[in-house]
């Protein structure tokens, strides 16, 4: 129980097209040191949705202040959802490494389904 766990509490989230989707993720520990990334899909073909360390992700906002000391909440919100955003999203903890960070642990995944925009 002491080792870091990646918690993605929602197994499934359904959002209407045009709305924002909140994907929740938290860590149970600050150790090991290293960034959090969000991906859509798993394996070699997964798509990077958000990288805590670097990059520009205009549709993604973090739900809590990630720079805040002792922050364990790495939930994100994705704006203006379209059917193309459907899929399973994984919150992944990386361990700081040299030269590259190493994947440490992944959440169980949250399946995002997109409903037609209400008329």
């Amino acid at each position: 129980e002491d080792e870091l766990q990646v918690i993605q509490p929602e197994k499934s989230v359904s959002v209407a097209a045009g709305e924002s989707a909140t994907l929740r993720c938290a860590m149970t520990s600050l150790i090991p040191v290293g960034p959090i990334m969000w991906f859509r899909g798993a394996g070699a073909g997964r798509e990077l949705i958000y990288n805590q360390k670097e990059g520009h992700f205009p549709r993604v906002t973090t739900v809590s202040e990630l720079t805040k000391r002792n922050n364990l909440d790495f939930s994100i919100s994705i704006s203006n959802i379209t059917p193309a955003d459907a899929g399973t999203y994984y919150c992944v903890k990386f361990r700081k490494g040299s030269p590259d960070d190493v994947e440490f642990k992944s959440g169980a995944g949250t399946e995002l389904s997109v409903r037609a925009k209400p008329s």
Partner: antibody, heavy 120, light 112 residues
């Protein structure tokens, strides 16, 4: 051995509020999901909402939205459920239950229940 | 929200008989990770509910092996191979795939 111990029975007047506590002992608190489930006399089980203390914010069933507030105090490993604008139909046994937040293990630990009676 | 429908409403059995309880969901409870997010609970008279089966078919700790869960997607079954007097109570299914978490209406098991 994890245990959930709930506060005692309450008798309330219509229109008032009730706050029920659920203290966890013997295990990790912040990363588990605490749900509140109620059971009216002779009726089935009804999920009211739940909280994972590590996130701080709660999820609520739409039926109770605006009338129920679920909170958690990590320092005392205690969860709370407050229900306002009480009516006679809120007379029920209120349970807290613990589950791992991924849902893999079901609600494996339940409190003993708190009877709330709403009567004028 | 996901609606769970249980049948029958009441099951009256003699000790040693086999019990079959059904739970049907209004939408699939099968996640892309391969798990079915359906649990079974037993509430004995005057007691808090207790977990019997999680993820559709996994027995919770301490649950006798006469209880078994099966099914996938929208149709689930709880079987009690040989009913005993201590098995009386109301059995509920629950879906944990998405919030709001919902329960079935329950099946009451009684001994003749």
């Amino acid at each position: 051995q994890v245990q959930l111990v709930q506060s005692g029975a309450e008798v309330k007047k219509p229109g008032s509020s009730v706050k029920v506590s659920c203290k966890a002992s013997g295990g990790t608190f912040s990363s588990y999901a605490i749900s509140w489930v109620r059971q009216a006399p002779g009726q089935g089980l009804e999920w009211m909402g739940g909280i994972i203390p590590i996130f701080g914010t709660a999820n609520y069933a739409q039926k109770f939205q605006g009338r129920v507030t679920i909170t958690a105090d990590e320092s005392t490993s205690t969860a709370y459920m407050e229900l306002s604008s009480l009516r006679s139909e809120d007379t029920a046994v209120y349970y807290c239950a613990r589950a791992k937040p991924r849902g893999d293990y079901g609600m494996d630990v339940w409190g003993q229940g708190t009877t709330v009676t709403v009567s004028s | 929200e996901i609606v769970l429908t249980q049948s029958p409403a009441t099951l009256s059995l003699s000790p040693g008989e086999r019990a079959t309880l059904s739970c049907r969901s209004s939408q699939s409870l099968l996640h892309s990770n391969g798990y079915n997010y359906l649990d079974w609970y037993l509430q004995k008279p005057g007691q808090s509910p207790q977990l019997l089966i999680y993820l559709g078919s996994n027995r919770a700790s301490g649950v006798p092996d006469r209880f078994s869960g099966s099914g996938s997607g929208t149709d689930f079954t709880l079987k009690i191979s040989r009913v005993e007097a201590e098995d009386v109570g109301v059995y509920y299914c629950l879906q944990a795939l998405q919030t709001p978490i919902t329960f079935g209406g329950g099946t009451k098991v009684e001994i003749k």
